[in-house]
């Protein structure tokens, strides 16, 4: 029999390299049975996760899974960091693994790193 617990399917150590000034949607895959749980996003600041209250979010429903989406309209350099989604379900708090956004910023050609550096770990050069 399939479990009817709420499950959040963010993979351990998941990460996204994204470009400042571009739109981006961060998805929290949510599996639930009957009633859709209340889901929130927070951003890690040291050991605490600060709830993102004033950010645009939406639900996307698919056949076997739903997605709670955090919208970046657009991505800003200070969006760099780790995020977590949490679901309240029957008085229980279920937390996802954290997912990390590496925000890359366009630099002028004179500041360009070497090709090898950029190809291997581009985000480190633009934090």
């Amino acid at each position: 029999k399939e479990s009817c617990d709420v499950q959040l399917y963010i993979k351990r150590q998941s990460e996204h390299s994204i470009l400042a000034g571009d739109p981006f949607e961060l998805e929290c895959p949510v599996k639930y049975c009957a009633n859709r749980p209340h889901v929130t996003w927070c951003k890690l600041n040291g050991t605490t996760c600060v709830k993102l209250e004033d950010r645009q979010t939406s639900w996307k429903e698919e056949k076997n899974i739903s997605f709670f989406i955090l919208h970046f309209e657009p991505v800003l350099p200070n969006d760099n960091g780790s995020y977590r989604c949490s679901a309240n379900f029957q008085s229980n708090l279920i937390e996802s693994h954290s997912t990390t956004l590496y925000v890359t910023d366009v630099k002028s050609a004179s500041e360009r790193p070497s090709k090898d550096e950029m190809a291997s770990r581009p985000w480190l050069l633009y934090r």
Epitope: G21, F24, E73, P74, V106
Partner: antibody, heavy 115, light 114 residues
Framework: EVQLVESGGGLVQPGGSLRLSCAAS????????IQWVRQAPGKGLEWVGF???????YYASRAKGRFTISRDDSKNSLYLQMNSLKTEDTAVYYC?????????WGQGTLVTVSS | DIQMTQSPSSLSASVGDRVTITCQAS??????LSWYQQKPGKAPKLLIY???TLASGVPSRFSGSGSGTDFTFTISSLQPEDIATYYC????????????????FGGGTKVEIK
């Protein structure tokens, strides 16, 4: 409704100038990277350049020195000023929101360079 | 300068077939690659960005993979509405703030139904 609308295309003689506009609605154009892409009749896509959210413009070498991308935040619009036009600049010109994640495109405006 | 080589330039497949298009960069572009679909008379539509991330609202039959210089775009089960031309685009030059003498778009692949 979130959209981009290009305008300003038309017929121009070789050596002439034209200014294309890209008007945004439903979002603040100044916060985004916006790229210009063109497509000659029956050909593939060709990158022209882009302006980043900080206002810095970058160009393909074929456009450098002849084309200028600018922004008017008060009009929520972007412009492509094209000078010294050549017959090979004949194309549909598109503006698109985002560089890596270009999720929104205009319908395009046709520029014909011919004598 | 980065050159993008896309192949094949055209292909014909049956409804339900798996379709694969490749794009090769002349130097490493990490994962800064997008894939677009364009139908006649219409603007391009983003399908995949960052090599493998499905754009919002795009059916899951479309997928992308690869990094460095070699990239693949796949339609797992071709549908009649997928008839279009598909393009890859390297956004690496924009990311590092350089520009290229070459076009960061591949030459396109026209997909037709058998």
């Amino acid at each position: 409704e979130v959209q981009l609308v290009e305008s300003g295309g038309g017929l121009v003689q070789p050596g002439g100038s034209l200014r294309l506009s890209c008007a945004a609605s439903g979002f603040d154009i100044s916060k985004y990277n916006i790229q210009w892409v063109r497509q000659a009749p029956g050909k593939g896509l060709e990158w022209v350049g882009f302006i980043n959210y900080g206002g810095s413009a970058y160009y393909a070498s074929r456009a450098k020195g002849r084309f200028t991308i600018s922004r008017d935040d008060s009009k929520n619009s972007l412009y492509l000023q094209m000078n010294s036009l050549k017959t090979e600049d004949t194309a549909v010109y598109y503006c698109a929101r985002g560089l890596s994640n270009s999720d929104l495109w205009g319908q395009g405006t046709l520029v014909t360079v011919s004598s | 300068d980065i050159q993008m080589t896309q192949s094949p330039s055209s292909l014909s497949a049956s409804v339900g077939d798996r379709v694969t298009i490749t794009c090769q960069a002349s130097q490493s572009i990490s994962s800064w690659l997008s894939w677009y679909q364009q139908k006649p008379g219409k603007a391009p539509k983003l399908l995949i960005y960052r090599a493998s991330t499905l754009a919002s609202g795009v059916p899951s039959r479309f997928s992308g993979s690869g990094s460095g210089t070699d990239f693949t775009f796949t339609i797992s089960s071709l549908q009649p509405e997928d008839i279009a031309t598909y393009y890859c685009q390297s956004t690496y030059g924009g990311v590092v703030g350089s520009t290229s003498d070459d076009n960061p778009f591949g030459g396109g692949t026209k997909v037709e139904i058998k």
